[in-house]
C-alpha cells in the first residue's frame, strides 16, 4: 500500500494515523506524516551501511 | 557541498511585509522538509513554519498563522517565507535549516543538520 | 503544542569538567529529540539527533540519552570550544518546539 498524500495545507488538520509503507529510498517522518527522503548509516569502523537499530551507536554518513 | 543562503530581510514598519528566500545548494529540497527559525535579539531559538516541497504541506507556529505564509519553488530550488502584517515582536534573526532523516526501521530519525546563515528582519516605526 | 523545558538556564563550568544539561517534554515524544549548540553570532550546529546519535564530525565527549519526556545532554570533558549555549528540540509532534537553551559559561 502507497504512502497516502493527502494534499491538505496544514499538517495539524490531518490525522495521525499509524504510519503508512514508504518506498525503498524513503522513511516515515511524524513531524510531517508523511514519507520523505531518508539517508543510510554507516558504522565507522567497517563502513557498512545499514538501517539504524535501537541501541546502535552508529554515525550518519556525511553530507547528502 | 550541501548549502543554505537566506536572503530578504530588512528594515521595515508595523503593518508591513517582506519575503525572504532560502536558496538551497548541494541537495534537491524536495526530498526534505524545510524549515524557517527565528532568533530574536539576545533570545531562544523559535520555530516559525515547514514546508515539505513534494505534496505541499505546511504548518506554522501560532504566534504566525495568518499572518505568514511558507512556499517552495522546486524548479528553483528555493523555500520562501512571506510575511505580512509584521509586528515589532517579529524582530529577529531568520534562519532556514534542511531536516534530515535517517532511517531507523522505516521511521525518520533526524533533525535540522544544515542551516543558512541568518537575515535579519527589523520592524520598527 | 508540547514544551520543552530545559536546566539549567545557565550553568558556570571549567575546562575539563562534565557537564550535564536536561531537557523534559511535556508529553511522550518517544525519541524525536535533537541537541543544539550555538555560539553567538553563528546558526545553530546539529549534535546529537534521535535523543542518543551523535550527529557526523561532532566529538564523541558529547552525547544523548533518554526516551519519553526526558532527556539529557552530557559533555564527558568541557573543552574551550564547547562555551555556547545548548537547545533540545522535539520533532515528534507538529509544531517542532526548542528548549528555552542552556548558556554556559566559563568559570
Known amino acids: 500500500m502507497g504512502a497516502r498524500r493527502l494534499r491538505v495545507r496544514s499538517q495539524r488538520s490531518r490525522d495521525s494515523s499509524v504510519p503508512t509503507q514508504c518506498n525503498q529510498t524513503e522513511c516515515f517522518d511524524p513531524l510531517v506524516r508523511n514519507c520523505v527522503s531518508c539517508e543510510l548509516f554507516h558504522t565507522p569502523d567497517t563502513g557498512h551501511t545499514s538501517s539504524l537499530e535501537p541501541g546502535t551507536a552508529l554515525q550518519p554518513q556525511e553530507g547528502s | 557541498e550541501v548549502q543554505l543562503v537566506e536572503s530578504g530581510g530588512g528594515l521595515v514598519q508595523p503593518g508591513g511585509s517582506l519575503r525572504l528566500s532560502c536558496a538551497a545548494s548541494?541537495?534537491?529540497?524536495?526530498?526534505?522538509?524545510i524549515h524557517w527559525v527565528r532568533q530574536a535579539p539576545g533570545k531562544g531559538l523559535e520555530w516559525v513554519a515547514w514546508v515539505l516541497p513534494s505534496v505541499g504541506f505546511t504548518d506554522y507556529a501560532d504566534s504566525v498563522k495568518g499572518r505568514f505564509t511558507i512556499s517552495a519553488d522546486t524548479s528553483k530550488n528555493t523555500a520562501y517565507l512571506q510575511m505580512n502584517s509584521l509586528r515589532a515582536e517579529d524582530t529577529a534573526v531568520y534562519y532556514c535549516a534542511r531536516r534530515v532523516c535517517y532511517n531507523r526501521l522505516g521511521v525518520c530519525a533526524g533533525g535540522m543538520d544544515y542551516w543558512g546563515q541568518g537575515t535579519l528582519v527589523t520592524v520598527s516605526s | 503544542d508540547i514544551q520543552m523545558t530545559q536546566s539549567p538556564s545557565s550553568l558556570s563550568a571549567s575546562v575539563g569538567d562534565r557537564v550535564t544539561i536536561t531537557c523534559r517534554a511535556s508529553?511522550?515524544?518517544?525519541?524525536?529529540v535533537a541537541w543544539y549548540q550555538q555560539k553567538p553570532g553563528k546558526a545553530p550546529k546539529l549534535l546529537i539527533f534521535?535523543?542518543?546519535f551523535l550527529y557526523s564530525g561532532v566529538p564523541s565527549r558529547f552525547s544523548g540519552s533518554g526516551s519519553g519526556t526526558d532527556f539529557t545532554l552530557t559533555i564527558s570533558s568541557l573543552q574551550p570550544e564547547d562555551f555556547a549555549t545548548y537547545y533540545c528540540?522535539?520533532?515528534?509532534?507538529?509544531?517542532?518546539?526548542f528548549g528555552q537553551g542552556t548558556k554556559v559559561e566559563i568559570k
Open positions: 508529553q511522550d515524544v518517544a525519541t524525536a
Open positions: 528540540q522535539q520533532s515528534q509532534i507538529s509544531p517542532p518546539t
Open positions: 534521535a535523543a542518543s
Open positions: 548541494g541537495f534537491t529540497i524536495s526530498s526534505s522538509s
